[in-house]
């Protein structure tokens, strides 16, 4: 038998859950890393205390063809209130240092874990 009954759409994910899911994905990336992440691609370092979510996306979106971070890129696009395209940098984004994607992910993960522990879900 095929059930064609409609389902109520799931409610919006609470910020705390959304943050936890992003942390879990970043943990997954760091734990499953065998070869250099994204072939050692370099991205702009960001200020983790200033408009972090959009800045992180603006940096990572410039990495293409790296399946390991595609889910992270998708998740971050939902964390940013404006649409981010490759090559776009907001005024919150200071472009002075490039680091490897693997280091970027580790730094972001550490900071998000700290926010989660402190209950800063906004």
């Amino acid at each position: 038998l095929t059930c064609l009954g409609g389902f109520a759409s799931p409610g919006p994910v609470p910020p705390s859950t959304a943050l936890r899911e992003l942390i879990e994905e970043l943990v997954n990336i760091t734990q499953n890393q065998k070869a250099p992440l994204c072939n050692g691609s370099m991205v702009w370092s960001i200020n983790l205390t200033a408009g972090m979510y959009c800045a992180a996306l603006e940096s990572l979106i410039n990495v293409s063809g790296c399946s390991a971070i595609e889910k992270t890129q998708r998740m971050l696009s939902g964390f940013c209130p404006h649409k981010v395209s490759a090559g776009q940098f907001s005024s919150l984004h200071v472009r002075d240092t490039k680091i490897e994607v693997a280091q970027f992910v580790k730094d972001l993960l550490l900071h998000l874990k700290k926010l989660f522990r402190e209950g800063q879900f906004n």
Epitope: P15, G78, F121, N122
Partner: antibody
Framework: EVQLVQSGAEVLKPGATVLISCKVS????????MHWVQQAPGKGLEWMGR????????KYAPKFHDRVTLTADTSTDTAYMELSSLRSEDTAVYYC???????????WGQGTLVTVSS | QAVVTQEPSLTVSPGGTVTLTCRSS?????????ANWFQQKPGQAPRTLIY???NRAPWTPARFSGSLLGGKAALTLSGAQPEDEAEYYC?????????FGTGTKVTVL
């Protein structure tokens, strides 16, 4: 010149569904998130949700998630907001607005008044 | 869900200074809340004044400035003009949705 032109006022009965359109010009809709905001008479602003017209991905406010549907047609540069199971407290002006970093919510539609009355 | 609170009303003298605040029930407001401030006059659509905490929209007069102040987003109006009399709203981003503030009615008297 950037413009967001919304469809006209509606008077509907409780339980009905309303569909409001927001036709944009002066930019390509797929390059921006489009947000929708409700304002009941004499009340404040309430964010309803947003859509990425390029892929249809949506985010909804908890209050509206089970009754609102946001869609967009990139071929006509038009965003749509559908609100179902209308009740009297849905009587409000509904705004579409373009959001981008270099001037978030900078451009707003003129608003569409929806009156729900039996 | 978070609640975003503003002063219900404030009065400022012409040429005077007034600061409106935007408080989050979940804790300190940060730059990751991408605070926006809007001005709305009766019968008109809202108009963006400040975005991303402290960036002025191209049409926003220099007398308006945005900042973070004591864990809240703040809008300071220095040198108030009669035309600044309006309702002011803030909006904060909470990871995946916006919440508007309750609004502040500013009277220039």
């Amino acid at each position: 010149e950037v413009q967001l032109v919304q469809s006209g006022a509606e008077v509907l009965k409780p339980g009905a569904t309303v569909l409001i359109s927001c036709k944009v010009s002066g930019f390509t809709i797929k390059d921006y998130y489009m947000h929708w905001v409700q304002q009941a008479p004499g009340k404040g602003l309430e964010w309803m949700g947003r859509i990425d017209p390029e892929d249809g991905e949506t985010k909804y406010a908890p209050k509206f998630h089970d009754r609102v549907t946001l869609t967009a047609d990139t071929s006509t540069d038009t965003a749509y907001m559908e609100l179902s199971s209308l009740r009297s407290e849905d009587t409000a002006v509904y705004y579409c607005t373009r959001y981008d970093y270099y001037g978030p919510f900078a451009y707003w539609g003129q608003g569409t008044l929806v009156t729900v009355s039996s | 869900q978070a609640v975003v609170t503003q002063e219900p009303s404030l009065t400022v003298s012409p040429g005077g200074t007034v600061t409106l605040t935007c408080r989050s029930s979940t804790g300190a407001v940060t730059t990751s809340n991408y605070a926006n401030w809007f001005q709305q006059k009766p019968g008109q659509a809202p108009r963006t004044l400040i975005y991303g905490t402290n960036n002025r929209a191209p049409w926003t007069p220099a007398r308006f400035s945005g900042s973070l102040l004591g864990g809240k987003a703040a809008l300071t109006l220095s040198g108030a003009q009669p035309e600044d009399e309006a309702e002011y709203y803030c909006a904060l981003w909470y990871i995946n949705h916006f919440i508007f503030g309750t609004g502040t009615k500013v009277t220039v008297l």
